[in-house]
Interface confidence: low
Amino acid sequence: MEDEKPKVNPKLYMCVCEGLSCGNEDHCEGQQCFSSLSINDGFHVYQKGCFQVYEQGKMTCKTPPSPGQAVECCQGDWCNRNITAQLPTKGKSFPGTQNFHLE
């Protein structure tokens, strides 16, 4: 056997998946999980899912929240289950990168 047991890929996490991109699935697997909130035509659109390529997630997760979109990322099985992304309050200062949750 090529890899040490148990046969688990340590870079892959199970994530909660919610939103149109999930189809009928309620979970996905990727190298990072995320929870996002965006405003489309005045409606708040919440999504949860996973980035299957680390670089893709790294770019998105380091984007500062804006009045129209916020993304929170984490690494760990189901780590995005209880994360709800929040848009910044007007006038409130915030750091240039999102918190990175490790579970």
Epitope: M1, E2, K5, P6, K7, N9, L12, M14, E29, Q52
Partner: antibody, heavy 115, light 107 residues
């Protein structure tokens, strides 16, 4: 979100070679162990073997001499070949993706071996 | 090979009953034990991984416990849609093996 779609011949004669292919959609092909599992009618589940994106394989020792699993990363597909089939190989064959468990499954293909 | 012995092979219970299935490994498999549900005519579905972790979307009436060689799977309140065959499976080493299955019916 990973979806597996499988196909292959459903009716074989004894001594022929079973051949099935499984296509992977919406998934990172390098992130999983790609497996084949079979289930004889009315019976339990038997693991046949696995392959990763690099082509490294592991087989069930009970079938090692007859089974071959291969991968085509350019098409995100993997295949099963089982030689010298007999009636005992009659089963539903599933392709499946394994990480901490077999989370994603193909629809299953009933393969019947009969003369 | 690691043998997985599942019991009972079949059971019948009433809606609302508590149902427990056991699985015994022939050697220590740590926590590398999963449970699947297979409804008639369908592929198996992963319910619980690593002994007790519920896959999201799976109802909380399903649970698992154990470690080492002895494991159990419980449906706290049996529902009509739970009619299925349940399998345990280890992934501590190769070959991966399954228990023989437990068929659950409504009395």
């Amino acid at each position: 979100q990973v979806q597996l779609q499988q196909w292959g011949a459903g009716l074989l004669k004894p001594s022929e070679t079973l051949s099935l292919t499984c296509a992977v959609y919406n998934g990172s092909f390098s992130s999983y162990y790609w497996n084949w599992i079979r289930q004889p009618p009315g019976k339990g589940l038997e693991w046949l073997g696995e392959i990763n994106h690099r082509g490294s394989t592991n087989y069930n020792p009970s079938l090692t001499s007859r089974v071959t699993i291969s991968v085509d990363t350019s098409k995100n597909q993997f295949s099963l070949k089982l030689t010298s089939v007999t009636a005992a190989d009659t089963a539903i064959y599933y392709c499946t993706a394994h990480t901490r468990g077999f989370l994603y499954w193909g629809q299953g293909t009933l393969v019947t071996v009969s003369s | 090979d690691i043998q997985m012995t599942q019991s009972p092979s079949s059971l019948s219970a009433s809606v609302g009953d508590r149902v427990t299935i056991t699985c015994q490994a022939s050697q220590d498999i740590n926590i590398y034990l999963n449970w699947y549900q297979q409804q008639p005519g369908k592929a198996p579905k992963l319910l619980i991984y690593d002994v007790s972790n519920l896959v999201p979307g799976v109802p909380s009436r399903f649970s698992g416990t154990g470690s080492g060689t002895h494991f159990s799977f419980t449906i706290s309140s049996l529902q009509p849609e739970d009619i299925a065959t349940y399998y345990c499976q280890h992934y501590d080493d190769l070959p991966l093996t399954f228990g023989g299955g437990t068929t659950v019916a409504i009395r």
